[in-house]
Interface confidence: low
């Protein structure tokens, strides 16, 4: 179960790194803070 959750996080991180533009680092930081908080 833990492995699956980690995989989901990795997929989300990849999606974020692709879809967020260089100009929206704040949005990206906020999202990673949310991820850290959900572990």
């Amino acid at each position: 179960k833990h492995k699956c959750f980690r995989k989901e996080l990795e997929e989300n991180e990849t999606l974020e790194s692709i879809m967020n533009t260089a100009e929206s680092e704040e949005e990206l930081k906020k999202y990673f803070y949310y991820l850290e908080g959900s572990k």
Partner: antibody, heavy 118, light 112 residues
């Protein structure tokens, strides 16, 4: 104004290769993720591939994985799609689109037609 | 993959009358960041797709206010309050919540 112009389409035999390009203007190209989306004649839209603003992250649809590669040259404001081992089902209009923050494809090119036929 | 469905697939409308298109996703489009990445695109005959609505209900710049989007989770709606001749075309919903990004089959809007 913000503009995307695709080129490189044409008629190609099955199994052969083709390289599409997308020239961007009117915005800071190096700040945006870029996508390819295709549309078979008379059909719906199919997302093909994306590349991050810096070129470090790429993702592909399963239907093209291992056959298509996506790249970009930020110094020339150009996006590329290298299509290898082409199949009849790859026949479509190929659009490039800009990926804005907010997870949205906000600007689209006019498209370039790829025909795969023997 | 997330499957997107649309109803109706064809919608003949009278000029000046409202039109409504429904889009449903096979799973929730709410991402872990709390946002729902559902867009609506318009494709006029012979033209490339054009963004109308993003994140369910946000109109893209230059889009007339007769277009509106609503919904949540797995069910979404695009409404045209008063159809004009230039609105003829195919309307697609699209999800960018999860790879691979997927589109609905499209709804053809034409004039009765």
């Amino acid at each position: 104004q913000v503009q995307l112009v695709e080129s490189g389409g044409g008629v190609v035999q099955p199994g052969r290769s083709l390289r599409l390009s997308c020239a961007a203007s009117g915005f800071t190209f190096s700040s945006y993720g870029m996508h390819w989306v295709r549309q078979a004649p008379g059909k719906g839209l199919e997302w093909v591939a994306v590349i991050s603003y810096d070129g470090n992250n790429k993702h592909f649809a399963d239907s093209v994985k291992g056959r298509f590669t996506i790249s970009r040259d930020n110094s020339k404001n150009t996006l590329n799609l290298q299509m290898n081992s082409l199949r009849a089902e790859d026949r479509a209009v190929y659009y490039c689109a800009r990926g804005a923050s907010g997870f949205v494809l906000d600007i689209w090119g006019q498209g370039t037609m790829v025909t795969v036929s023997s | 993959d997330i499957v997107m469905t649309q109803t109706p697939l064809s919608s003949p409308v009278t000029l000046g009358q409202p039109a409504s298109i429904s889009c449903r996703s096979s799973q929730s489009l709410v991402r872990s960041d709390g946002n729902t990445y559902l867009s609506w695109l318009q494709q006029r005959p012979g033209q490339p797709p054009r963004l109308l609505i993003y994140k369910i209900s946000n109109r893209f710049s230059g889009v007339p206010d007769r277009f509106s989007g609503s919904g949540a989770g797995t069910d979404f709606t695009l409404k045209i309050s008063r159809v004009e001749a230039e609105d003829v075309g195919i309307y697609f919903c699209m999800q960018t919540t999860q790879f691979p990004f997927t589109f609905g089959p499209g709804t053809k809007v034409d004039i009765k």
